[in-house]
């Protein structure tokens, strides 16, 4: 059957996949869509109710923070 992730298991998966980057429950504003009226897609919609793979999870990781310079 479809591989879904919900609740605490979804949070665990996001924390693991995103490592030290952190993650969003909703894609950042403007992510993957030029329409301001497009409804914001959330990870729960995408992974709890539909098949969810690692690439889908990675889309909700925060960007890598640039290394601090001296």
């Amino acid at each position: 059957g479809p591989e879904t992730l919900c609740g605490a298991e979804l949070v665990d998966a996001l924390q693991f996949v995103c490592g030290d980057r952190g993650f969003y429950f909703n894609k950042p504003t403007g992510y993957g869509s030029s329409s301001r009226r497009a409804p914001q897609t959330g990870i729960v919609d995408e992974c709890c109710f539909r098949s969810c793979d690692l690439r889908r999870l990675e889309m909700y990781c925060a960007p890598l923070k640039p290394a601090k310079s001296a």
Epitope: P2, E3, L5, D12, A13, Q15, F16, V17, C18, G19, D20, R21, S51, C52, D53, L54, R55, E58, C61, L64
Partner: antibody
């Protein structure tokens, strides 16, 4: 070059907790590019992924074992550990620790393995 | 979980032969598949990742192909050191799962 070495008791009694440690040498466990995992192989059988850990301590476990598994990392010792509780004879296996490419590569494969350690569950 | 199946479960071949092993996933996994070689008493060794990319240091006689649900590992000219068991692994979904293995032995 980087190497992994498992250590821990080779014999565990039923209902007790199996404890293993993997020592990383020749490199740092604190790499944003890599994850660290445990895989086991019962004698004469195939491979089963137990779970993985990131250097920050975040974990993800195979749901089939989740209720019995705990993983931890000690960056000061360059080690990560596995605990498997309430073991039975079915947990008898060779346990491998492995390095896994993570999100920065987008692949999630095990590119470096320890030699493995046989753990027998018997009274 | 995604179930991985391999065929054949074992194959007998001679040095110089070409051998092809098939791996099938119970649902589509794009190209997120790896192949490992394991010799008796040793740890698995990564051969191929991303279905067709050769891991550094692995001889070019090993090649991988496929996407979606069907994948193959081909050893173009079998060498004595290639007699081993080969496993596929999907890296598309949690939990990561392996095929049951294909043993390549001497005819």
């Amino acid at each position: 070059q980087l190497q992994l070495q498992e250590s821990g008791p080779g014999l565990v009694k039923p209902s007790e907790t199996l404890s293993l440690t993997c020592t990383v040498s020749g490199g740092s466990i604190r790499s944003s590019s890599y994850y660290w995992g445990w895989i086991r192989q019962p004698p004469g059988k195939g491979l089963e992924w137990i779970g993985g850990i990131y250097y920050s301590g975040s974990t993800y476990y195979n749901p089939s074992l989740k209720s019995r598994v705990t993983m931890s990392v000690d960056t000061s010792k360059n080690q990560f550990s596995l605990k498997l509780s309430s073991v039975t004879a079915a947990d008898t296996a060779v346990y491998y620790c492995a390095r896994q490419r993570g999100h920065s590569s987008g692949w999630w494969y095990f590119d470096l393995w320890g030699r493995g350690t046989l753990v027998t569950v018997s009274s | 979980d995604i179930q991985m199946t391999q065929s054949p479960s074992s194959v007998s071949a001679s040095v110089g032969d070409s051998v092809t092993i098939t791996c099938r996933a119970s649902q589509g996994i794009s190209s997120y598949l790896a192949w490992y070689q394991q010799k008796p008493g040793k740890a698995p060794k990564l051969l191929i990742y991303a279905a067709s990319s050769l891991q550094s240091g692995v001889p070019s006689r090993f090649s991988g192909n496929g996407s979606g649900t069907d994948f193959t590992l081909t050893i173009s000219s079998l060498q004595p050191e290639d007699f081993a068991t080969y496993y596929c692994q999907q890296a598309n979904n949690f939990p990561f799962t392996f095929g049951p293995g294909t043993k390549v032995d001497i005819k």
